[in-house]
């Protein structure tokens, strides 16, 4: 048997990805963990095994469709539950009710690019991946540029409160190399959480014309 | 393997009540969502709406006005109640297991029901 | 007017292949709802044909197989058979009704 709190904490990607991490501070020493998932109005079922990502946190991915397939919808629920081997046995050692549009992270965003670059300024575009169309202009954005000697940490957030998929980078240095990630969130669920961050696109500012001010 | 049998008047007049019954053999109604589609005569299919084991309903929006659909697990069975009813309600009625968010399979015999006077 | 389009009919000679379309809009088949096929032969009850874009249930041939691109899905039946004849629906969710919906039907007449 195993004692102590666990925290089991899932997201839907508003297509058909469902990933979670359970967080068990008993130890739990070569257990075959894994989630299941049971929609309440559907015929499938899906199961993923967990797999550790430290000493007591455990995460899987429910693949429920192809990637852009809309496999759940706002009235859909979805009994979740993490069930772990014990001799012949599975054990129920942790269950919820999920409500998939309440608890949304979307994929991070894709294809950055520069679509325009200055001496000052530079002028870049992206892509939002997997997301769905209940969402139509419903989403917000923040992004981030990473300057030469600081870290991400350090970087100010810049945000775009609207399906906007694209920015204007000002007051940058000429000649320059930087970083830029952005990241989405839908308006929507009362659970929802931001993105990751997107890969880091890295951009260089051209340099100054000789003779000119900066 | 799950079998549906329905029933139920197969005249009504105009302005009545429409009323068919569906039981579900060889499993449980606590399974899963139970819906009613209809196909007037020689024209295609049309949702009309769904219920599970605990009383939990769906309906197609264009006829939710009139239709009440009801489940007696105690008996396997559920129903559907559509209210003032016209020519245009005149259908073949299926039951079906099955919600609107999935696929329709099995279905029952189906019921012809005439509105006339 | 069905939400989903399919052609009204369509025919071939025995041993042929035959393709039936269903075309949808943005809140049903071009939002990534799944499609499914019955054929209703006649004077019989509907029966499921393909669930979920691709799937054939148990019995149902091989010479059944469907796809689904973008806001369209389609049937494809080869080497036609007499008994192939009837009428071919299509059905999906939409989100904006809330409901399920079907394409009008396509009559298959095997020449």
């Known amino acids: 048997a195993v004692n102590g709190t666990s925290q089991f904490t899932c997201f839907y990607n508003s297509r058909a990805n469902i990933s979670c991490v359970w967080s068990q501070d008993g130890a739990l020493q070569d257990t075959s963990c894994q989630v299941h998932a049971w929609p309440d109005r559907r015929r499938w079922n899906q199961t993923c095994e967990l797999l550790p990502v430290s000493q007591a946190s455990w995460a899987c991915n429910l693949i429920l469709g192809a990637p852009d397939s809309q496999k759940l919808t706002t009235v859909d629920i979805v009994t979740l539950r993490v069930l772990c081997r014990e001799g012949v046995r599975w054990r129920v050692m942790a269950i919820q009710d999920f409500k998939p549009f309440e608890n949304l992270r979307l994929m991070a965003p894709i294809s950055l690019q520069v679509v325009h670059v200055e001496t000052h300024r530079c002028n870049i575009s992206w892509e939002i991946s997997q997301a769905s169309h209940y969402f139509e202009r419903h989403l917000e954005f923040e992004a981030r540029t990473l300057s030469p000697g600081h870290t991400w940490e350090e970087a100010p957030l810049l945000t775009l409160k609207q399906k906007q998929e694209w920015i204007c980078l000002e007051t940058l240095t000429p000649d320059t190399q930087y970083e830029f990630q952005v990241r989405v969130k839908p308006l929507q669920g009362e659970f929802t959480t931001w993105s990751p961050w997107s890969q880091p696109l890295a951009f260089r500012t051209k340099p100054a014309a000789l003779g000119k001010d900066t | 393997q799950v079998q549906l049998q329905q029933w139920g008047p197969g005249l009504v007049k105009p302005s009545e009540t429409l009323s068919l019954t569906c039981t579900v053999s060889?499993?449980?109604?606590?399974?899963?969502?139970w819906s009613w589609i209809r196909q007037p005569p020689g024209k295609g299919l049309e949702w009309i709406g769904e219920i599970n084991h605990s009383g939990s309903t769906n309906y197609n929006p264009s006829l939710k006005s009139r239709v009440t659909i009801s489940v007696d697990t105690s008996k396997n069975q559920f129903s559907l109640k559509l209210s003032s009813v016209t020519a245009a309600d005149t259908a073949v009625y299926y039951c079906?297991?099955?919600?609107?968010?999935?696929?329709?399979?099995?279905w029952g015999q189906g019921t012809l029901v005439t509105v006339s006077s | 007017q069905s939400v989903l389009t399919q052609p009204p009919s369509v025919s071939g000679a025995p041993g042929q292949r035959v393709t039936i379309s269903c075309t949808g809009g943005?809140?049903?088949?071009?939002?990534?709802?799944?499609v499914h096929w019955y054929q209703q032969l006649p004077g019989t009850v509907p029966k499921l044909l393909i669930y979920?874009?691709?799937n054939r249930p148990s019995g149902v041939p091989d010479r059944f197989s469907a796809s689904k691109s973008g806001t369209s899905a389609s049937l494809v039946i080869t080497g036609l058979q007499a008994e192939d004849e009837g009428d071919y629906y299509c059905q999906s969710y939409d989100s904006s009704l809330r409901a399920s919906v079907f394409g009008g039907g396509t009559m298959l007449t095997v020449l």
């Open positions: 079906a297991g099955g919600s609107n968010l999935d696929w329709f399979d099995p």
């Open positions: 060889g499993g449980s109604i606590s399974s899963y969502y």
């Open positions: 979920d874009n691709t």
């Open positions: 943005s809140s049903n088949v071009g939002a990534g709802y799944d």
